[in-house]
Interface confidence: medium
């Protein structure tokens, strides 16, 4: 079997000029390809893999919500030499999402690592975002976390980090079909400059504080100690899965065998993100642009 | 159908500029990625630059870095080369060409561009 | 100097076998890159051929075929006519230009 192999990462891997093909290994009869792209209130970005894959032919699409992060996941999988370029990963431009204009400051200002590498998201060299309320959503929360894609023997990663709904989630995260977005939340301005290491406790949940032993001589503190031990789980609801995409059409046949141009992009929204301008083409970033199978 | 036309071109001075259009038709103009690829008098196809579909990422030539812009407007249908400082080694026909499946499918009839004083 | 080499001109007679070759390196062809091939009819604008390495787009006679192997690729065509007196050329991206790259171009003549 012969497969088309690419990795993006919020760039142009897998434009139309950069198209490799690869031989599979024997055994393998499918071919693989997987986009996940992320959505901030300030923009969006895509990573996408193809290659030789592993397990059954066919799809899955799926929708996720971080605290308003939002994310898309298609995997296809095909059992046909260079099956594997049906769906559009092409980049975009990381256009402000919607009418950000639109929406008054509230405030807060979060890093935002938005298709960024990981040594352009370290620590405080990120660019700094002002965050607002949308659609009834509030934003004051940073947020600091990773999204992953795993396909064809292929791990790739970016840092995320941006305005969300929470200011105090812990080690949270979505997953879909080889793709995981998780991170961290944390209030007040510029405050997701690393959450890596952050505690599950924060200011709704007291925490354990260890007082002296009592002297023989007084009378015992009165104080109220919450003594809880085990580290509050989150409420899966909400983590919400979300609608998934529509459905991607077969490459276009005849005149358009050798075009990309009509092939659908990948669709979704969710609650408080419909005002977003973007919010229904992705891949998006610049990437990435078509990423680059460097035509010729 | 798909028709890709080019305008533009002429003879300008060494150290001038240029702006070249390609006015497409006949395809979803903003999913595409787009290219300009020339060809001096009797020799052979360069690549010269080229733009992601949204317009965010652009691609140059070593040969034409720093002297060469291109741009599109995704509401016209029109992929722009601005060409700036021309030296008489740009002498060519620019042909713009869309970016289908990883090769140039089309391509438009072509400018030409004289450089000379 | 074209960064993937072609043979300037070769020919043949009407009905005969003809392949054109093209090599490339480790940065282009044989980093993996799909080989294209473009055809351009005398006076006219390039015109492609075969994409993909092997692949024709609909309009294109099956008597072209393409094929790739290592850091060379090659285009036969097969049952000569007088109309495919053209120039050929070969295309792939380069990792280290950065772009896509082409062959110096073939002249095929039919004798």
């Known amino acids: 079997l012969e497969c088309y192999s690419c990795v993006q990462k919020a760039d142009d891997g897998c434009s139309p000029n950069k198209m490799k093909t690869v031989k599979c290994a024997p055994g393998v009869d499918v071919c693989t390809e997987a986009v996940g792209a992320v959505e901030t209130i300030h923009g969006q970005f895509s990573l996408a893999v193809r290659g030789c894959g592993s397990g059954l032919p066919g799809k899955n699409d799926r929708g996720l919500d971080l605290h308003g992060l939002l994310a898309f996941i298609q995997l296809q999988q095909c059992a046909q030499d260079r099956c594997n370029a049906k769906l559009n990963l092409t980049s975009r431009a990381l256009d402000p999402a919607g009418n950000e204009s639109a929406y008054p400051p509230n405030g807060v200002e979060c890093y935002s690592c938005v298709g960024l590498s990981r040594e352009a998201c370290q620590g405080t060299s990120p660019p700094v975002v002002s965050c607002y309320n949308a659609s009834d959503h509030v934003y004051k929360g940073c947020f600091d976390g990773n999204v992953t894609l795993t396909a064809a023997n292929v791990t790739v990663s970016l840092p995320v980090r941006g305005c969300v709904q929470d200011e105090f989630c812990t080690r949270d995260g979505v997953t879909g079909p080889g793709f995981t977005l998780s991170g961290s939340c944390c209030q007040g301005s510029r405050c997701n400059s690393d959450l890596r290491n952050k505690t599950y406790f924060s200011p709704r949940i007291p925490p354990l504080v260890r007082l002296p032993p009592p002297e023989p001589t007084t009378v015992a503190s009165t104080t109220s100690v919450t003594t809880s031990t085990s580290a509050p789980v989150r409420p899966t609801s909400t983590t919400k899965p979300m609608p998934a995409p529509t459905s991607q059409t077969p490459r276009q046949g005849v005149e358009h065998e050798a075009s990309r141009d009509e092939e659908p992009r990948l669709t979704g929204g969710a609650a408080g993100h419909q005002d977003r301008s973007n919010s229904g083409q992705y891949p998006a970033k610049g990437g990435p642009q078509q990423p680059h199978n460097k035509g010729c | 159908e798909v028709q890709l036309l080019e305008s533009g071109g002429g003879l300008v001075q060494p150290g001038g500029s240029l702006r070249l259009s390609c006015a497409a038709s006949?395809?979803?103009?903003?999913?595409?990625?787009m290219s300009w690829v020339r060809q001096a008098p009797g020799k052979g196809l360069e690549w010269v630059s080229y733009i992601s579909s949204s317009g965010s990422s652009t691609y140059y030539a070593d040969s034409v870095k720093g002297r060469f812009t291109i741009s599109r407007d995704n509401s016209k249908n029109t992929l722009y080369l601005q060409m700036n400082s021309l030296r008489a080694e740009d002498t060519a026909v620019y042909y713009c060409?869309?970016?289908?499946?990883?090769?140039?499918?089309?391509w438009g009839q072509g400018t030409l561009v004289t450089v000379s004083s | 100097q074209s960064v993937l080499t072609q043979p300037p001109s070769a020919s043949g007679t009407p009905g005969q076998r003809v392949t054109i070759s093209c090599s490339g390196s480790s940065s282009n062809i044989g980093a993996g890159y799909v080989v294209h091939w473009y055809q351009q009819l005398p006076g006219t604008a390039p015109k492609l051929l075969i994409y993909?390495?092997?692949q024709r787009p609909s309009g294109v006679p099956d008597r072209f075929s393409g094929s790739k192997s290592g850091t060379s690729a090659s285009l036969a065509i097969s049952g000569l006519r007088s109309e495919d007196e053209a120039d050929y050329y070969c295309a792939a991206f380069d990792d280290r230009l950065s772009g896509p790259v082409f062959g110096g171009g073939t002249k095929l003549t039919v004798l």
């Open positions: 006949g395809f979803t103009f903003s999913s595409a990625w």
């Open positions: 993909d390495n092997n």
């Open positions: 060409a869309r970016e289908g499946l990883w090769a140039f499918d089309k």
